[in-house]
């Protein structure tokens, strides 16, 4: 029961986590800009991975896409990069972790199977949530570093003078949701590791041959001395015995109604 | 990588008119405010109008009522109108954008046009 609350919990903070990245990725304020020497009205500016866009106190908004790949900072082409593979890992994750899913019944999926998907969904998540961190924080440096030692650096260029226009750069909300949601997903992936732990048979060391009477005749046939001392062909404990011995995985996988007796 | 090319400019009479414009050329990803300065012998550079993307405009109180600014966003051009021009008005007008470049859109600069001289005498 817990690991299925485990297993559960950990699908849907990942499922609130991974939509948070995509949120977090298509949002337009990664960073926000106050443009403050202008002297007619105040000018806000915000940018995120895909378009800028320039707002005014006068109502006037417009937002323009970054139509071209090659011009743009190798940061930016970095971050975009991360995002995209967090969403992509995590999506998959997300269809592996539905199959996983101990409460869903597909055919007749062993628990083994399940536990071996639920590890996978969860390494998923896991380096889903790190992406998004990442590209967030890798951003978030961009700002810092690049924007905010730079005020009013003049020199002349072509025709005429040119100066940085001195902005306050400041961390848009995109940058929160996504430090967020890649907290969120790596939290639940580590919930689906937890969980599969769980839901893994327990393997003994040794392969033990249990006998069991199955029957009110037991026929004897030759061999048995051979699986027992691990002479001979017989060495992989297979049945020799018709009703009476089993491996101890067979006994696990397949038990009958003697079994109890 | 960008230029601002003034035009325009010229001897005129005082109570006469002119057109100046600005042509914003280059790598430009967005220009968001345009203005004219103009800077007199001997004295400072200082604003004459300034215009946002979205059209609000600044005038300063000696060319109010005088000059008026616009722009065509598409064109990425600046205009000045100027109209019952006195002998003050002699000056070097400078136009003036705050832009994106398309090499970095995430940083903003100033740019500034070389001048276009306008005399105002009889």
């Known amino acids: 029961m817990a690991v299925t609350a485990c297993q559960g919990l950990g699908f849907v903070v990942s499922l609130i986590g991974i939509a948070g990245i995509i949120a977090a990725t298509c949002m337009d304020q990664w960073s926000t800009q106050d443009l403050y020497n202008n002297p007619v009205t105040a000018v806000f500016n915000y940018q995120g991975l895909w378009r800028s866009c320039v707002r005014e106190s006068s109502g006037f908004t417009e937002c323009r896409g970054y139509f071209t790949l090659l011009g743009l900072p190798a940061m930016l082409q970095a971050v975009r990069a991360l995002m995209i593979v967090g969403i992509v890992l995590g999506a998959i994750g997300l269809l592996v972790s539905i199959f996983a899913l101990k409460c869903i019944r597909i055919g007749s999926m062993e628990d083994s199977a399940k536990a071996n998907m639920t590890l996978t969904s969860g390494i998923m998540f896991i380096v889903s949530g790190l992406c998004a961190i990442a590209g967030v924080s890798v951003f978030a440096n961009m700002l810092v570093t690049n924007f905010w030692m730079s005020t009013a650096n003049m020199y002349t260029g072509m025709g005429g003078m040119v100066q940085t226009v001195q902005t306050r750069y400041t961390f848009g909300a995109a940058l929160f949701v996504g430090w967020v949601a890649g907290g969120l997903t790596l939290i639940g992936g580590v919930m689906m590791c937890i969980a599969c732990r769980g839901l893994a048979p327990e393997e003994t060391n040794y392969k033990a041959v249990s006998y069991h009477a199955s029957g009110h005749s037991v026929a004897y046939k030759p061999g048995g001395f051979k699986a027992s001392t691990g002479f001979g062909s017989n060495t992989k404990n297979k049945k020799i015995y018709d009703g009476g011995a089993r491996t101890e995985d067979e006994v696990q996988s397949y038990p009958s109604k003697h079994d109890y007796v | 990588q960008v230029q601002l090319v003034e035009s325009g400019g010229g001897l005129v009479q005082p109570g006469g008119s002119l057109r100046l414009s600005c042509a914003a050329s280059g790598s430009i990803f967005l220009i968001n405010a345009m203005g004219w300065y103009r800077q007199a012998p001997g004295k400072q550079r200082e604003l004459v109008a300034v215009i946002t993307r979205g059209g609000s405009a600044n005038y300063a109180d000696s060319v109010k009522g005088r000059f008026t600014i616009s722009r065509d966003n598409s064109k990425n051009t600046l205009y000045l109108q100027m109209n019952s021009l006195r002998a003050e008005d002699t000056a070097v007008y400078y136009c003036?954008?705050?832009?994106?470049?398309?090499?970095?859109?995430?940083?903003?600069?100033?740019?500034w046009g070389q001048g276009t001289l306008v005399t105002v005498s009889s």
């Open positions: 003036n954008a705050d832009l994106n470049l398309r090499s970095d859109p995430f940083k903003w600069y100033t740019f």
